[in-house]
Amino acid sequence: WQVRRPPTWGQVQPKDVPRSWGHGSSPALEPLEAEVRKQRDSCQLVLVESIPQDLPFAAGSLSAQPLGQAWLQLLDTAQESVHVASYYWSLTGPDIGVNDSSSQLGEALLQKLQQLLGRNISLAVATSSPTLARKSTDLQVLAARGAQVRRVPMGRLTRGVLHSKFWVVDGRHIYMGSANMDWRSLTQVKELGAVIYNCSHLAQDLEKTFQTYWVLGVPKAVLPKTWPQNFSSHINRFQPFQGLFDGVPTTAYFSASPPALCPQGRTPDLEALLAVMGSAQEFIYASVMEYFPTTRFSHPRRYWPVLDNALRAAAFSKGVRVRLLVSCGLNTDPTMFPYLRSLQALSNPAANVSVDVKVFIVPVGNHSNIPFSRVNHSKFMVTEKAAYIGTSNWSEDYFSSTTGVGLVVTQSPGAQPAGATVQEQLRQLFERDWSSRYAVGLDGQAPGQDCVWQG
């Protein structure tokens, strides 16, 4: 079966991109067609992660599927189209002037993408302007082989960047998470994401977010005051997608930021985060690269306590156990630490207020030749009720001016053996990191001290 629909406002079209499904337009399917699709959907969610080289965890530690392996598998699955949103591309060592064997996985991925194009599978890339990889030739190489590339001028449009990181493959499969299209994300940076297979409902909903970037990537694009109806979502916080993931009853939805890129029905990312925090009754565990209750990249900085207040309120008013694991690397802005200390200062076990903050330090070891690496880049949160996997760091810019996406998943325990729910898996990954020797309490982190592994 094939879904063919007429072109819609500015959206990617064949050969432009996917030839066999609705290009991000609203599902206006005939009942029978919808039924066929439902039968064909057998959604499966797999957590994926990158563990940097030379970062051993204790023997027997839980781990998710390696990200590089998952990406290569997704590309093997592709038959029609691959849509990628990524802040920047830097899949080869020479891109950043580095000669290191750990770039080989990224280079293999770039090769694989070129092979896809050779097999007449369409590739559409939305990337950011401004970008972090101004010397990278990856996108020129792919464009020369037929990939469509659009640089979305978020700097001009919203004074932010396109910081999203996700793939939609054949309108059925998804990757989303913290990893950019960067070889370091596969071997030198700690990342966390999710792959969802065989789930056209969710994939085509996420495709609508890709389409918002795509239409803004044309010359002289302007932000629409109201997004056309075909960008609207019917899957959100109030009406999540409901289905069986590997037999487990699951609800899920994608959120997006900034609000200016949230068409009707799309839950804003900040709202999703706050909703997950607000519904927690036992614990909130969050792992984010950066945590600033301020603006980040604008001058002068403004105070922005929205997430900070939500964590404090959960701990203080509801007795929720809060754990925050923040990254600490050579390129970490040290002005973050006073905010972390302030948050932790709220903790008062005697009054049943539990707030713990640690920093995660990836030892540089003999990888000092690789810039902007050896860091925990993950952006996720888990409660006893839900898993949130995101692409945004926790400061105002990422929610007000910069693009990002979040995935909120809740699975019903008891339908499967214990430990099978996504939120339980994510909790275990968090606790593995939290209890590892790389997670250091703030007391062990002198003010202004460089984030250098002292182990």
Epitope: Y87, S128, S129, P130, T131, L132, R134, K135, R151, P153, G155, R156, V161, H163, M289, E290, F297, S327, G329, L330, N331, T332, D333, P334, S368, P371, F372, V375, H377, N393, D450
Partner: antibody
């Protein structure tokens, strides 16, 4: 407050080496920035010469590549410029500056702190 | 290397005037452009980064705009303390390159 101050001889003979020091106070040169030398020729033209990164790596202007070296002494929080085989064309005011900030995810880089500059004349 | 050209090497204007200084790159620099002010005593200060973002402490009468190869710095209400030379600088690629400067004087 971050401050940068250049020092070194004001007069250098042709064919000799020019050596300058930039002393940094209020910030560690092992953190978050490219520590840069920029010179301004008579008539105002500015030329980026090169940097030493927070991690000790270098990048130089190809027009100077065979003559320039930028090093540092982290214990003194200083970085240095050495320019070999100078000619009268190297007469300029030499400024040190920092470029960055090189925080994760930040695409906006600029020279936000400059030294006052030191004038070097190349003459026999 | 990317060449940066400021065609006007000097200009004079009256207090309160709106002044625009332009800068052209030899190729598209995708908004990776900064503006600096050099006072007569030689001190250099960052004014604007990434084409249009005002640096901390810079008065709001300064603004920047442009795209592709053409950029400009505007001072909306000229004050005596704005007497200086203004430089554009690209950070799209290495080596970093600067415009030749525009010297601004008061009539």
């Amino acid at each position: 407050d971050v401050q940068l101050q250049e020092s070194g001889p004001g007069l250098v003979k042709p064919s000799q080496s020019l050596s300058l020091t930039c002393s940094v106070t209020g910030y560690s040169i092992t953190s978050h920035y490219y520590w840069t030398w920029i010179r301004q020729f008579p008539g105002n033209k500015l030329e980026w010469m090169g940097y030493i990164s927070y991690d000790g790596s270098n990048n130089y202007n190809p027009s100077l590549k065979n003559r320039i070296s930028i090093t540092r002494d982290t214990s003194k929080n200083q970085f240095f410029l050495k320019l070999n085989s100078v000619t009268t064309e190297d007469t300029a005011t030499y400024n040190c500056a920092r470029e960055g900030p090189l925080y994760y995810g930040n695409p906006y880089w600029y020279f936000d702190v400059w030294g006052a500059g030191t004038t070097v004349t190349v003459s026999s | 290397d990317i060449q940066m050209t400021q065609t006007t090497s000097s200009l004079s204007a009256s207090l309160g005037d709106r002044v625009t200084i332009s800068c052209r790159a030899s190729q598209d620099i995708d908004n990776y452009l900064n503006w600096y002010q050099q006072k007569p005593d030689g001190t250099v200060k960052l004014l604007i980064y990434y084409t249009s973002r005002l640096h901390s402490g810079v008065p709001s009468r300064f603004s920047g705009s442009g795209s592709g190869t053409d950029y400009s710095l505007t001072i909306s209400n000229l004050e005596q303390e704005d007497v200086a030379t203004y430089f554009c600088q690209q950070f799209n690629t290495l080596p970093r390159t600067f415009g030749g400067g525009t010297k601004l004087e008061i009539k």
